[in-house]
């Protein structure tokens, strides 16, 4: 056969679906690889062909579209399972071709089992809600295209294993779950089960997401430098190790990049000749506020080093701050015998 543009196995799109539920999988060619859509390709006389490789097999085989009740079907650029079975797991390929053109891509599909409390190996999307902020909502994800708008599905929401019906701050409103207030106690996994009829059969779609309650923008402040501060003086003798921690608190801010850095005499440590090492550690509060500590270390400090300016800088979407460390050379203690001798006029 003639050459085919093979985009290989697209592992970026690891698709996971639940066993015994409908699944609609769009051919990734039109989503991510080609500059035209299925309609354009179809009008140009191109044909979309599907085949698959079963789990732990090397043999590519055609997909059986003649199963009872059309369990697997193709509609335009979508491969449909009504419903999936565990042994549908494998690598699926969609190939677009005519006599002069060919392009194909493979992607892994994993059919996953869930228990009665919706626990499964499924990777869960995370939705962040601001703490004590007012009405916020989560939406049952990835249910578009499964049923026409004329069909009114039944939606049931669960937190963990429990049906949500009398949680005082959480209100199920169809495809949305509304939080009148979000509290730390609302952290957890939320599942929507969408039930809809189709051709005399009833199908269920199960979607789980993780809710993480984070710091509210109402309470967000610019970075706060806890150390260095005016109360601590780093007093060292030449030859000793100088350790200065820069500890900065950052309020949680959605999509904010938090940065901490040191300057020595106005320059980044990489741009000067001193032998400096900087170690960073990061910790988070329950609402994802962040504390970053960068420890500046000079193993054997010189008297020159003790005259330099050491400034800790911090930046977030809320602003930039800086604080200089108080560094000084320790005055050596008087050596008793010499002082005494001088006092008696000895030479």
């Amino acid at each position: 056969s003639e050459r085919c543009d093979d985009w290989g196995l697209d592992t970026m799109r690891q698709i996971q679906v639940f066993e015994d539920e409908p699944a609609r999988i769009k051919c990734p060619l039109f989503e991510h690889f080609l500059k035209f859509n299925y309609s354009t390709a179809h009008s140009a006389g191109l044909t979309l062909i599907w085949y698959w490789t079963r789990q732990d097999r090397d043999l590519e085989e055609p997909i059986n579209f003649r199963l009872p009740e059309n369990r697997i079907s193709k509609e335009k650029d979508v491969l449909w399972f009504r419903p999936t079975l565990l042994n549908d797991t494998g690598n699926y390929t969609c190939m677009l071709r005519n006599t002069t053109y060919c392009s194909k891509v493979a992607f892994p599909l994993e059919v996953v089992q869930k228990d009665s409390c919706f626990n499964s190996p499924m990777k869960l999307p995370v939705h962040k809600l601001y703490i004590e902020y007012g009405i916020q909502r989560i939406t049952c994800p990835n249910v578009d295209g499964y049923f026409p708008s004329s069909v009114k599905p039944t939606i049931t929401w669960y937190m963990g294993c429990y049906k949500i019906q009398n949680f005082n701050n959480v209100i199920p409103e169809g495809m949305n779950l509304s939080f009148l207030i979000a509290l730390i106690s609302n952290n957890g996994n939320y599942t929507c089960v969408v039930t809809y009829p189709e051709n005399g059969r009833t199908f269920h779609l199960t979607r789980t997401l993780t809710v993480k309650v984070v710091g509210s923008p109402k309470n967000a402040v610019p970075p706060v430098i806890h150390s260095p501060n005016d109360h601590v003086v780093y007093e060292k003798e030449p030859g000793e190790e100088l350790l200065i921690p820069c500890t900065v608190y950052f309020s949680f801010l959605m999509d904010s990049r938090n940065e901490v850095w040191w300057t020595i005499d106005g320059k980044k440590p990489d741009d000067i000749t001193i032998d400096v090492t900087i170690n960073e550690s990061i910790s988070h509060s329950r609402t994802e506020d962040e504390t970053r500590t960068q420890i500046l270390s000079i193993k054997k400090v010189t008297s020159e080093d003790l005259k330099r300016s050491y400034v800790c800088h911090a930046r977030s979407a809320k602003g930039e701050v800086a604080k200089a460390a108080k560094v000084k050379q320790k005055v050596p203690a008087p050596r008793y015998t010499v002082e005494l001798a001088c006092g008696f006029g000895a030479t």
């Epitope: 007012g134 009405i135 009398n166 005082n168 209100i171 199920p172 409103e173 207030i181 106690s185």
Partner: antibody, heavy 117, light 110 residues
């Protein structure tokens, strides 16, 4: 239980603050506390709610915004400040809360506010 | 704003009979509806929440049904103690007024 206090006979244009006191529980875990009123011989009318014990997330009926203010003043009291009172505000004012996540499950006996010249 | 409309009022039935009260929401409020009973000189009492779930301690002769915009409270095996005014309460977070009571329905027991 809940108990309202502060109801009084006031003149039109006056201000008044009603207090709802909880006994047997405190608002530390963000209780949903609401005020509802009932004019003599009329139906129930929702005024406002607050998540007491939190950062004071509040919800108001559109007609009550601006003239009525709900707030939590301690771990066991919620107040309703009312300004520019008119005869139409004459009613029994109830404080209602949730228990076990059920809205308006717990009610106080009510306090009467009469606005008359 | 969310508007709750209750019908009919008043409604009367004999002891042992059945009474049906309807409540219509101006918006699709799914199952976010509660029913209350109020007797003269008393605060309201929660009977049903989430449209059909009986509140604790409420007799099983009270039942609720419906979802979306149409809801019903049914009192079967009517007792003289059931003479009261009944209110529905809708919850709708998309409205400026997230809570709204119906106008009330008086039940008279003959």
């Amino acid at each position: 239980s809940l108990e309202e206090s502060g109801g009084d006979l006031v003149k039109p244009g006056a201000s008044l603050t009603l207090t709802c006191t909880a006994s047997g529980f405190s608002f530390s875990s963000s209780y949903y506390m609401c005020w509802v009123r009932q004019a003599p011989g009329k139906g129930l009318e929702w005024i406002a709610c607050i998540y007491a014990g939190s950062s004071g997330v509040t919800y108001y009926a559109s007609w009550a915004k601006g003239r009525f203010t709900i707030s939590d003043t301690s771990s066991t009291t919620v107040t309703l400040q009312m300004t520019s009172l008119t005869a139409a505000d004459t009613a029994t004012y109830f404080c209602a809360s949730e228990t076990d996540g059920n809205y308006f499950n717990l009610w106080g006996p009510g306090t009467l506010v009469t606005v008359s010249s | 704003a969310l508007v709750m409309t209750q019908t009919p009022s008043p409604v009367s039935a004999a002891v042992g009979g059945t009474v049906t009260i309807n409540c219509q929401a101006s918006e699709d409020i799914y199952s976010n509806l509660a029913w209350f009973q109020q007797k003269p000189g008393q605060p309201p009492k929660l009977l049903i929440y989430r449209a059909s779930t009986l509140a604790s301690g409420v007799p099983s002769r009270f039942s609720g049904s419906g979802s979306g915009t149409e809801f019903t409270l049914t009192i079967s095996g009517l007792q003289s103690d059931d003479a009261a005014t009944y209110y529905c309460l809708g919850v709708y977070t998309y409205s400026t007024d997230i809570h709204a009571f119906g106008g009330g329905t008086e039940v008279v027991v003959k």
